[in-house]
Each structure stands twice: as structure tokens, then as C-alpha cells.
């Protein structure tokens, strides 16, 4: 079979098939017969991740402080900065362009998994035999006391909000 | 300017191998198969097989299928032909040469517009 | 593979001659032919491409014909540094495969 297109790091112009510039460079010049490609680096703070023939670099992502982000990872010229929020904040999307605060679990849930830089808090109902009495970001279900192991018996039954209530089983005489 | 420097001559036993290394400068080295041939004394050029600098992927002559081992180093912008097992037949000059597509008249060509001065390898007990 | 047959396998000329190479291909490979020039001691170059495109460069004298199986190359009027060994070589698929070579003497 014959050749049907240039090859993968290649771009076709004025009939020849010339090299794309590397990550982390941008295109000066296209080749011709007699000349390569032309590629120069990013700058600072520019980068290009792929094969391009890109004319300009793109800007390394700001961290915003004012909207509670930090750099989680420079950037090179060959990889964009990644951004992450500050303790108690998530990123409202996957490109982490702001924050916001972890939300807490309402009394009645619990914690299923911790907030992280990226990721809100997850929430899950306390099952039964499980409360929680508090609006926390951290607290887990707590399991309701068992009151047979101290000898005492229920008094009132515990709900996904509240724990049992214990007290002295009834003596007969 | 564009250029590839081959390595220098070779003496070799049978039996033996031989690793040729082929240096690119003046183009982006990943960006371009490099071809290696041969051609034995008085006589015409055999294609041995190409890899492609990027990857690494190769391709090589049916021929020459489990003797021969292309690589390269991008970071040197470097490609290596290994022979192994050779024979007296083997002796030939071995060129490393630029693949360079082209379109022209609504189809593409591929030609070797740079190639490397050659290396001669010597087989001989 | 493809097979590529060259004639004449050597030839003759003076300068100022006119010279014809010819080169039959075993299948059809349209017009993917490239004519290259080695001289004594050195790596092949390209000469045309594909079948009968010069190369800026190439002086006009060279010129290449054909399709399909059967093609040419033409030196019109044969000059010192134009002594050497002329190949051509298929494109078309892989491997590809060179004609034998045509050397061309001084007469």
C-alpha cells in the first residue's frame, strides 16, 4: 500500500511533511526543501504539553490566592500549574478555578469520605444502630451505646439524630 | 544544517556483532523515521529496516528479522543498528538515512533526502 | 517485495552526452520512483522525486519519466561531476526496494 499521510510527529504544508515542534517549544518557522522546522522554547511561565505548531505558548495557570487557591505543582515549559485550595476549601471544578468551603454533615449523616484540595466532603445517612448529633465535616456515624454491656437496659431508643438512652434494669423483688 | 554522523569502521569476526551509531543534528530528531542500509562491496543498496525516533517502534526487513536491533537515544539524538551473528557476507557499507515524506500530485512519497557519510563493517576471520 | 530492475547495468559516455537510464519496476507503483546519485566513496543523494520531480538544487539537465512499471532518467548533456552510480528506488511500499545501479564511466 502506499503512503496515504505524513507520519505522527509530522504536519503537511506547501507539500512537505514537516516535524512538529516538541513539547515545551512553539513554531517559529514552517520547513520548506531546504530548511527544518523552526522551534523555539517557551518562555517563563509558558508552556505547550503537546506535539504543536503553535505560534504562541500558553500562560501557566494563576493561583489566585484571593480565591483560595495555591500552586499544588509548577508549571514547566511542558506542563500547565496545577492549582489546589487552601485547608478547608475544595475546587468547585475539575480545572480548580476557585473554592469553596467544605460542606459539613448534618446531624442525622455522617462523614463518609474527608473533603481534600479538590474534592468535597461525602455525606452518607447514619444506618440504623448509628447517629450523629452534630453538623461536623469530620465526624463519622458513632455507633448507639450498647446499653447490655453495662449491665443497663434501653430506656429510650436511639434514632439516626440521637443515641439510646441507658438506665438500671427494674428489680424485682 | 541537517547532518548525520555515523560511527567509524569496523573489523569484526564471524560470530560476532557490530553496533553501528548514527548522530542527527540541525533537526528535531523525534520528528523523522530514520532508515538504515547497506551496501556490499560493488554492489546496490538493501533497506534493512527503520525505527522511528519517537517511539521507538520499528519495522525491519524480513531479511534481516532476529539479527538485527534498532534503537535510539533521544536525549543524544542518537540511532544504533545492531548486528549480531555475522557472517563474511555481511561486510558491506552501512548507511543511516533521514526519511523525509513529501506530497506531490495528490499522493505522498517517502524518499532519504540526508544520509550518513557510512560505516564500513568488515567481516573477516 | 517489489523488485526493481536497472538498465544498463554500467555505461560509457563522454562529456556532453546524452545520457538515458531506464528502470522497470516488478508491479505497478504509479509514480512512486526516487532516482538518487552516489559518487565514488560517498552516500547516495536524491536526484528526483517522485518519478519526475526535481528537486531545487538539481540541475536541469536531469530529468525523470514515467509511471505505472516503466521509467527513465535523462541526462541531456552529460558534465564532469555528473560520473558516478545512479539508483532508483520504489516508494510505493515496504520494504522498499532499489534497482541495482547504473554505472555511468567516462568514456
Known amino acids: 500500500e502506499p503512503p496515504t499521510a505524513c507520519r505522527e510527529k509530522q504536519y503537511l504544508i506547501n507539500s512537505q511533511c514537516c516535524s512538529l515542534c516538541q513539547p515545551g517549544q512553539k513554531l517559529v518557522s514552517d520547513c520548506t526543501e531546504f530548511t527544518e522546522t523552526e522551534c523555539l522554547p517557551c518562555g517563563e511561565s509558558e508552556f505547550l504539553d503537546t506535539w504543536n505548531r503553535e505560534t504562541r505558548c500558553h500562560q501557566h495557570k494563576y493561583c489566585d490566592p484571593n480565591l483560595g487557591l495555591r500552586v499544588q505543582q509548577k508549571g514547566t515549559s511542558e506542563t500547565d500549574t496545577i492549582c489546589t485550595c487552601e485547608e478547608g476549601l475544595h475546587c468547585t471544578s475539575e480545572s480548580c478555578e476557585s473554592c469553596v468551603p467544605h460542606r459539613s454533615c448534618l446531624p442525622g449523616f455522617g462523614v463518609k469520605q474527608i473533603a481534600t484540595g479538590v474534592s468535597d466532603t461525602i455525606c452518607e445517612p447514619c444506618p440504623v444502630g448509628f447517629f450523629s448529633n452534630v453538623s461536623s465535616a469530620f465526624e463519622k456515624c458513632r455507633p448507639w451505646t450498647s446499653c447490655e454491656t453495662k449491665d443497663l437496659v434501653v430506656q429510650q431508643a436511639g434514632t439516626n439524630k440521637t443515641d439510646v438512652v441507658c438506665g438500671p434494669q427494674d428489680r424485682q423483688r | 544544517q541537517v547532518q548525520l554522523v555515523q560511527s567509524g569502521a569496523e573489523v569484526k569476526k564471524p560470530g560476532a556483532s557490530v553496533k553501528v551509531s548514527c548522530k542527527a543534528s540541525?533537526?528535531?530528531?523525534?520528528?523523522?523515521?530514520m532508515y538504515w542500509l547497506r551496501q556490499a562491496p560493488g554492489q546496490g543498496l538493501e533497506w534493512m529496516g527503520w525505527?522511528?525516533?519517537?517511539?521507538?517502534?520499528?519495522n525491519y526487513a524480513q531479511k534481516f528479522q532476529g539479527r538485527v536491533t534498532m534503537t535510539r537515544d533521544t536525549s543524544i539524538s542518537t540511532a544504533f543498528m545492531e548486528l549480531s551473528r555475522l557472517r563474511s557476507d555481511d561486510t558491506a557499507v552501512y548507511y543511516c538515512?533521514?526519511?523525509?515524506?513529501?506530497?506531490?500530485?495528490?499522493?505522498?512519497?517517502?524518499?532519504?533526502?540526508?544520509w550518513g557519510q557510512g560505516t564500513t563493517v568488515t567481516v573477516s576471520s | 517485495d517489489i523488485q526493481m530492475t536497472q538498465s544498463p547495468s554500467s555505461l560509457s559516455a563522454s562529456v556532453g552526452d546524452r545520457v538515458t537510464i531506464t528502470c522497470r519496476a516488478g508491479?505497478?507503483?504509479?509514480?512512486?520512483l526516487n532516482w538518487y546519485q552516489q559518487n565514488p566513496g560517498k552516500a547516495p543523494k536524491v536526484l528526483i522525486h517522485?518519478?519526475?520531480s526535481l528537486p531545487s538544487g538539481v540541475p536541469s539537465r536531469f530529468s525523470g519519466s514515467g509511471s505505472g512499471t516503466d521509467f527513465s532518467l535523462t541526462i541531456s548533456s552529460l558534465q564532469p561531476e555528473d560520473f558516478g552510480t545512479y539508483f532508483c528506488?520504489?516508494?510505493?511500499?515496504?520494504?522498499?526496494?532499489f534497482g541495482g545501479g547504473t554505472k555511468v564511466e567516462l568514456k
Open positions: 538515512a533521514r526519511e523525509k515524506p513529501r506530497y506531490f500530485d495528490s499522493f505522498y512519497y517517502y524518499l532519504m533526502d540526508v
Open positions: 540541525g533537526y528535531t530528531f523525534p520528528g523523522y523515521y
Open positions: 525505527i522511528n525516533p519517537d517511539s521507538g517502534d520499528t
Open positions: 508491479q505497478n507503483i504509479s509514480r512512486h
Open positions: 517522485p518519478a519526475s
Open positions: 528506488q520504489q516508494s510505493y511500499s515496504t520494504p522498499p526496494t
